[in-house]
């Protein structure tokens, strides 16, 4: 019969290593006799036989820990007593490793330029794990902007738009790497004007293009303001290039005013704006020479004003130094010639002169005359003004200038579009509509040649029709 | 009578230039304005560019830069170089007399665009 | 740029009835210097060339049947047919001339019943 012997524990526990969810093993071979109990504690704390997180083998030789948390981290002891001799105990650590785990990523961030980011990154593992930034694709270096803090993030202050990108932190120990998803930081910037509108003094009726670019992030809007309310006529044209925003308001101008950009854009619930004006102010009408070819205004002269249409814009040209005076001098100098002419061709060739002299302006991009139509100078030159036509020419082949009309400066009509072939391309003369209408007989035309483009004016029932009120349609 | 003729369409790689050609007869052809307008397959009309008789000229924007309205007073004759072409600049292309409204048209020339 | 919008995009008429195409610009185009609006209407029948039918928004191009006709003012303009004819079956196309680029409407298809 074998001799009763006090627990002894040959093997005794030693730290283990472990990783989280993997299975940790504790062994406490204890040799006695009777065979001991044995018993285990966690941090003193006796771990129960029903705990399903355990499996005790062996005759509690055996301690696993089938799924390691890292809560289980702690001393392990084993206890055996047999009843002989006092209970003996043998302990060890359980260390849990942890491959690094981003419990706190990173998040997009919108941030206002000049202020301090912070883009977290906590971190757990086992050996503490080592935290570093990557932007973009390159390790991003710490300087006196740029730092990444003892909990992990990353921290920039003084913010500038050249911080703006893709970041994502990694967390490093000897067991692994771990990264977190990209995140964005967006830099946003202040609207700003880089390029205020230019004041002008320009000439009634000119049209004129006010700029204004201003740069922000996000990209800012611009609107214009006339003398404190909305542009309530113009047209805006923009154009948006590397965040820069580039608009153009084009005037008509007809009266002077205060015109103000203002560039705004958003932050979160906030705006920022920036502002800047120009004055457009309307300068002395014989002074204005709008561009190379020529400018369009109201006709403010005396000579034609019963002619032309009122408050309409005609052409000036510019090719004269003083084209209001020029061309007034010169429509003045026509009309007395025409007091030698007759009846019937004095009030068609007036209507003829003042509309080619200060032809009719179209709009566009740049304001460009509109001539008059063939058939309406031809309806002149051969219906109503026929004879003086005539003798005109007679005259002038024999050097002759006695009729009052050779000093005219009448149009080749030949050189001018006709509105059979494109309506829309010259200026009719309703004068001559209603005339003709009125007219029962027009002088014989004995020329040796009638023109193949006789005038076919257009009948008082077509679209063409205009009242002898409404002049310059 | 007006008549507008158009030549040289046909089919293009992308990238690559086309010169088209529209003679006019019928009317003074210098004394108009003159326009392209072009109309894909099954879709609607678009405007292309104008040259007035001072041979200026304005552009549609998707076009600008690449296409060059021109024209020859002497043989009556209104051009459109196309460079830079693109699968979408596929349509029938119309020479158009016309200041402000689109007035007398082409029967049009084909441009085809693809690889 | 200014931008025209059409309405509607198809409509079918039988012989005899009126029928109304709208069309709407984005910014006026109405010329104050001589208050005309410049707004046109074109006619593409299948297979063929686009032709004018009205100019300043109410002018009628020769040769184009009294039964058409055009309205409107500054931004929103109509083109009536006051009685269809087999003849008018179509597309319609609005435009505007006021600046370039002149740009068309997107076209309302006019269907016989």
């Known amino acids: 019969e074998k001799l009763p012997k006090a627990p002894v524990i040959t093997t005794p526990l030693e730290t283990v290593d472990a990783l989280v969810e993997e299975v940790a093993t504790f062994m406490c071979a204890v040799e006695s006799y009777p065979q001991p109990e044995i018993s285990w504690t966690r941090n003193k704390i006796l771990i129960k036989l029903f705990d399903t997180r355990y499996s005790i083998r062996e005759n509690g030789q055996l301690l696993t820990i089938l799924s390691v948390e890292d809560s289980d981290d702690g001393i392990y002891c084993c206890i055996a007593n047999n009843g002989v001799g006092g209970a003996v105990e043998s302990c060890g650590a359980l260390q849990v490793k942890m491959k690094p785990k981003i419990t706190r990523p990173p998040i997009n961030v919108k941030i206002i330029e000049g202020l301090k980011a912070v883009l977290p990154c906590t971190t757990m593992g086992n050996p503490k794990p080592s935290v570093s930034w990557i932007k973009g694709d390159n390790a991003l270096r710490e300087n006196s902007r740029i730092a990444v803090l003892e909990s992990g993030s990353l921290r920039i202050h003084n913010v500038q738009k050249e911080d703006a990108g893709q970041y994502r932190c990694v967390a490093k120990n000897s067991l692994g790497t771990a990264y977190s998803k990209l995140v964005k930081l967006e830099v946003e910037v202040f609207a700003r004007i880089l390029r205020a509108p230019e004041s002008h003094n320009v000439t009634f009726g000119s049209f004129v293009t006010l700029r204004c670019t201003a740069i922000g992030i996000p990209v800012p809007t611009i609107s214009w303001i006339e003398n404190g309310n909305a542009v309530s006529s113009g047209s805006i044209q923009e154009s948006v290039k590397d965040r820069v925003i580039d608009s153009r308001l084009q005037l008509f101008i007809t009266k002077p005013g205060l015109y103000t950009c203002i560039a705004t854009n958003k932050h979160g619930e906030k705006f920022s704006t920036a502002k800047a004006a120009a004055t457009v102010s309307i300068a002395e009408w014989s002074k204005s020479q709008k561009d190379s070819q020529g400018y369009c205004a109201q006709y403010r002269g005396e000579v034609c004003d019963a002619v032309l249409a009122k408050d309409a814009l005609v052409f000036f040209n510019t090719s004269y130094r003083d084209p209001e005076d020029a061309q007034e001098l010169l429509i003045h100098t026509a009309w007395n010639e025409l007091k030698a002419v007759s009846p019937l061709c004095r009030p068609a060739a007036e209507a003829l002169l003042c509309n080619h002299l200060f032809q009719e302006c179209s709009p566009g991009v740049v304001p460009t005359p509109m001539p008059i139509c063939r058939e309406y100078c031809l309806a002149v030159k051969e219906l109503f003004c026929a004879k003086e036509w005539q003798a005109m020419e007679g005259k002038a082949h024999r050097g002759l200038y006695r009729s009052g009309m050779h000093l005219l400066p009448v149009p080749e009509c030949s050189k001018l579009p006709s509105m059979h072939r494109d309506p829309t391309a010259c200026t009719r003369l309703p004068y001559l509509d209603y005339k003709k209408e009125n007219i029962t007989t027009f002088p014989s035309i004995t020329s040796s040649r009638p023109s193949a483009d006789i005038p076919n004016l257009p009948a008082s029932t077509s679209s063409f029709a205009v009242s002898p009120a409404y002049s310059m349609t | 009578e007006v008549q507008l003729v158009e030549s040289g369409g046909g089919l293009v790689q992308p990238g690559g230039s086309l010169s088209l050609s529209c003679v006019a007869s019928g009317f003074t052809f210098s004394l108009y304005y003159m326009n392209w307008v072009r109309q894909a397959p099954g879709k609607g009309l678009e405007w292309l560019s104008v040259?007035?008789?001072?041979?200026?000229?304005y552009y549609a924007d998707s076009v600008k830069g690449r296409f060059t309205i021109s024209r020859d007073n002497v043989k009556n004759t209104l051009y459109l170089q196309l460079n830079n072409l693109k699968p979408e600049d596929t349509a029938l292309y119309y020479c158009?007399?016309?200041?402000?409204?689109?007035?007398?048209w082409g029967q049009g020339t084909q441009v085809t665009v693809s690889s | 740029d200014i931008v025209m919008t059409q309405s509607p995009s198809s409509v079918t008429a039988s012989a005899g009835e009126r029928v109304t195409i709208n069309c709407r610009s984005s910014?006026?185009?109405?010329?104050?210097?001589?208050?005309?609006?410049?707004l046109n209407w074109y006619q593409q029948r299948l297979g063929q060339s686009p032709r004018l039918l009205i100019y300043?928004?109410?002018a009628r191009e020769s040769g184009v049947p009294d039964r058409f006709s055009g309205s409107g003012s500054t931004t929103n303009f109509t083109l009536t047919i006051s009685s269809f004819q087999p003849e008018d079956a179509a597309v319609y196309y609005c435009q505007q001339s006021y600046k370039p680029p002149y740009g068309f409407g997107s076209g309302t298809r006019l269907e016989i019943k």
């Open positions: 158009v007399l016309g200041r402000t409204a689109l007035v007398r």
């Open positions: 910014q006026s185009v109405l010329y104050s210097s001589n208050q005309k609006n410049y």
């Open positions: 300043w928004a109410s």
């Open positions: 040259i007035d008789t001072h041979s200026i000229a």
